[in-house]
């Protein structure tokens, strides 16, 4: 595909990436799919600086990111290494809480009202953020 050199309309450029901030809610999988069809992925937070940028744009609203443990270990959707990477969990999170009564635990990560992360039931209809990198070849699907 051709190289993307500027962000699409209604996307926000920051540090050679483009970000799109939803104003409606979807389950994590539908948000993930939405971003894939944008030739993008749910946001992957790799630094404190990127955390502050995203937090500034989403405000105090629960918002999905591209981090989940639906298949066991925590994984970023673009393949970024979780263990060695940036983390910003709330205290005592993630806890894979089963007490919500919705069946199963909590397998998808989101920004909470203060920006720190929590794991939650993936079916909850939260807002989401898509991210795509500038200078990458377009129309290459992100890694699962």
């Amino acid at each position: 595909g051709s190289e993307r050199t500027c962000c699409p309309v209604n996307w926000v450029e920051h540090e050679r990436s483009c970000y799109w901030f939803s104003r409606s809610g979807k389950a994590w999988a539908d948000a993930d799919n939405y971003c894939r069809l944008e030739d993008a992925h749910l946001v992957v937070v790799t630094s404190w600086e990127e955390q502050k940028f995203v937090q500034h744009h989403i405000g105090p609203v629960n918002t999905w990111m591209g981090l989940h443990d639906q298949n066991g270990p925590w994984k970023w959707v673009d393949g970024t290494d979780y263990e060695t990477g940036f983390k910003n969990w709330r205290p005592e999170q993630p806890d894979d809480w089963y007490g919500h009564g919705l069946g199963g635990g909590e397998d998808c990560a989101h920004f909470t009202d203060d920006g720190r992360w929590n794991d939650d039931v993936c079916q909850r209809p939260y807002r989401w953020v898509c991210e795509t990198e500038l200078d990458k070849a377009s129309q290459e699907p992100p890694l699962l």
């Epitope: 962000c7 939405y34 069809l37 030739d39």
Partner: antibody
């Protein structure tokens, strides 16, 4: 209830143009990716073009790239496909489809390219 | 592009039979897969989305399973109205791609 209704098909000569429309209702149009899919007589389903939920991604099949243009009007809940430089091999039934979450299809509109 | 390989391309079955159609993706598509039924001269109709979720109004004799690269559509007890063509479709990423189809015919 999700409804998709295509229109604009017809008989056109090679090299001619047509604009297909797809009127959508029953869902938040701007929140979903949409696609055009076609089916030539006696053949399988072939994706033609799509537009992402934000409108920022509008990819095309190689067979129509440079000739077809997808667009949408959110105020009218309508998806469009502008087809230029039509060829005989573009003859097909063209379907509009909502492709994320529960998948929905329109009834289709027939495009015949013939002299 | 993601290739979708569907098998068999056709099958003959009797009313009441259990029918299974398989679809394989050339790369991991998570569960972003739909199964579509099409009868001659009619528009496609979605049966299953998200690999295993039944579309509203579709009878429960249809079921889907799988994740990643391997998927299955099962019709638990074939009825006369089920004789049609069936396609798998990935919507993990553009370009959307379809399997070649399976034509289910009366034995």
């Amino acid at each position: 209830e999700v409804q998709l209704l295509e229109s604009g098909g017809g008989l056109v000569q090679p090299g001619g143009s047509l604009r297909l429309s797809c009127a959508a209702s029953g869902f938040t149009f701007s929140s979903y990716a949409m696609s055009w899919v076609r089916q030539a007589p006696g053949k399988g389903l072939e994706w033609v073009s799509g537009i992402s939920g934000s409108g920022g991604n509008t990819p095309y099949a190689d067979s129509v790239k440079g000739r077809f243009t997808i667009s949408r009007d959110i105020s009218k809940n309508t998806l469009y496909l502008q087809m230029n430089s039509l060829r005989a091999e573009d003859t097909a039934v063209y379907y509009c489809a909502k492709v994320v979450g529960a998948v929905h299809w329109g009834r289709g509109t027939l495009v015949t390219v013939s002299s | 592009d993601i290739q979708m390989t569907q098998s068999p391309s056709s099958l003959s079955a009797s009313v009441g039979d259990r029918v299974t159609i398989t679809c394989r993706a050339s790369q991991d598509i998570s569960n972003y897969l739909a199964w579509v039924q099409q009868k001659p001269g009619k528009a496609p109709k979605s049966l299953i989305y998200a690999a295993s979720s039944l579309q509203s109004g579709v009878p429960s004799k249809f079921s889907g399973s799988g994740s990643g690269t391997d998927f299955t559509l099962t019709i638990s007890s074939l009825q006369p109205e089920d004789f049609a063509s069936y396609y798998c479709q990935q919507y993990n990423s553009f370009p959307l791609t379809f399997g070649g189809g399976t034509k289910v015919e009366i034995k």
